[in-house]
C-alpha cells in the first residue's frame, strides 16, 4: 500500500520560516500534490501550493517557494512573517494523487520540543 | 473547444469482438489522462478502463479484465478500447472521458457516446 | 471498493425552490467528489469537482458541499432545464465509483 511521508523542519535562521518535505513512497506516478496547512484539503485545510509534474507550480502567500526535489517529493518553504504566518504547533498535510491509482495524504507538524533545524 | 468523438460501436453477437475509438481535439491530449465508461440502458455510471497521460498505468473494471484492452496514440490524439468475448451485460453506451488532474480526477468533458448492444 | 449511496432515489420539486441531494461513501474520499448532471439522451456533464468548487459556465444555483464521507448537491432555486439524473462520483481511491443517481422532476 502507498504512504505519504511529511516532515517539518523550523529554519534556525528565521525562526518563524518552516520547510515542509513530502514524499510519496508507492510505484504509481504522481500527477498532483497538494499541501495545505490546518488539516488535510478536504477537511477545513488552506492550500498552500499544487505542483503537477508537466504543468508547473503553484503557490499561494506564504509560502515562498515550492519545488520538486525528486518525481516523488517535494519540498515547501513558508515565509515566517506577516498575519498568515505559521507557528509552531502548525499542522501541514500533504495530499500524492497518482492516477488510476487515487491519492494519499499525511499531515505532520513540528515537534513541540524541537529546537530550531531539528525534523519532524 | 475540447471535442471527444467516439466511434465503433454497433451490434454483435456474444462472444464477438469490437473496437471503439475516441479523436480528441481542442486540447493537448498527451497530457490527459482518460477513460472509457459506460452506461447500460436505464442504468447508472460505470467507469470501464482508464488510462494516464504517460500510458505507464492502466485501470480495469473486474468483470472486463481479460477481456477488454485500453490503449492510446498521443500522436494521432485517440484513444481506444479493443473490447473481445462480448457479452449480453456489456450491452451499454461507451462513453469517452477526459480528467482533469486539477479537478481531483474529475471528468470534465465527455464524448457524446456510442452504442454497443450484444445479442444474437 | 468505495460504495457512493445518493439519497433519494428520485425528487420532486417545484420550480423556484430549493432541491437537495445527498451523496454518502463508505469511507473518507478527501474532498475527490464530484457531481454529474445528466439529461436523456446525452452524456453526462461535470457540475462541481472538488465537493463545492463550481465547473466553467455552471450556474451558481448549483453548489456542494460536505466532507469524509457525506456531500450534499444543492440547486437553490429549481428551474426547468434542471430536470435530469444527478451522479456523485469518487476519485480518491480506485476504482472510481459513482453514486446510482438521482431523478429530479418538477413537482
Known amino acids: 500500500t502507498p504512504e505519504v511521508w511529511v516532515q517539518v523542519r523550523m529554519e534556525a535562521t528565521e525562526l518563524s520560516s518552516f520547510t515542509i518535505r513530502c514524499g510519496f513512497l508507492g510505484s504509481g506516478s504522481i500527477s498532483l500534490v497538494t499541501v495545505s496547512w490546518g488539516g488535510p484539503n478536504g477537511a477545513g485545510g488552506t492550500t498552500l501550493a499544487v505542483l503537477h509534474p508537466e504543468r508547473g507550480i503553484r503557490q499561494w502567500a506564504p509560502a515562498r517557494q515550492a519545488r520538486w526535489e525528486t518525481q516523488s517529493s517535494i519540498s515547501l518553504i513558508l515565509e515566517g512573517s506577516g498575519a498568515s504566518s505559521p507557528c509552531a504547533n502548525t499542522t501541514f498535510c500533504c495530499k500524492f494523487a497518482s492516477f488510476p491509482e487515487g491519492s494519499w495524504e499525511a499531515c505532520g507538524s513540528l515537534p513541540p520540543s524541537s529546537d530550531p533545524g531539528l525534523s519532524a | 473547444e475540447v471535442q471527444l468523438v467516439e466511434s465503433g460501436g454497433g451490434l454483435v453477437q456474444p462472444g464477438g469482438s469490437l473496437r471503439l475509438s475516441c479523436a480528441a481535439s481542442g486540447f493537448t491530449f498527451s497530457s490527459y489522462h482518460m477513460s472509457w465508461v459506460r452506461q447500460a440502458p436505464g442504468k447508472g455510471l460505470e467507469l470501464v478502463s482508464a488510462?494516464?497521460?504517460?500510458?505507464?498505468?492502466?485501470y480495469y473494471l473486474d468483470t472486463v479484465k481479460g477481456r477488454f484492452t485500453i490503449s492510446r496514440d498521443n500522436a494521432k490524439n485517440s484513444l481506444y478500447l479493443q473490447m473481445n468475448s462480448l457479452r449480453a451485460e456489456d450491452t451499454a453506451v461507451y462513453y469517452c472521458?477526459?480528467?482533469?488532474?486539477?479537478?481531483?480526477?474529475?471528468?470534465?468533458?465527455w464524448g457524446q457516446g456510442t452504442l454497443v448492444t450484444v445479442s444474437s | 471498493d468505495i460504495v457512493m449511496t445518493q439519497s433519494p432515489d428520485s425528487l420532486a420539486v417545484s420550480l423556484g425552490e430549493r432541491a437537495t441531494i445527498n451523496c454518502k461513501a463508505s469511507?473518507?474520499?478527501?474532498?475527490?467528489v464530484a457531481w454529474y448532471q445528466q439529461k436523456p439522451g446525452q452524456p453526462p456533464k461535470l457540475l462541481i469537482y472538488y465537493v463545492s468548487h463550481r465547473f466553467t459556465g455552471v450556474p451558481d444555483r448549483f453548489s456542494g458541499s460536505g466532507s469524509g464521507t457525506d456531500f450534499t448537491l444543492t440547486i437553490s432555486s429549481l428551474q426547468a432545464e434542471d430536470v435530469a439524473v444527478y451522479f456523485c462520483h469518487q476519485a480518491y481511491r480506485s476504482p472510481w465509483t459513482f453514486g446510482q443517481g438521482t431523478k429530479l422532476e418538477i413537482k
Open positions: 469511507q473518507s474520499v478527501s474532498n475527490d
Open positions: 472521458a477526459r480528467h482533469e488532474d486539477y479537478y481531483g480526477f474529475a471528468m470534465d468533458y
Open positions: 488510462i494516464n497521460s504517460n500510458v505507464i498505468s492502466t
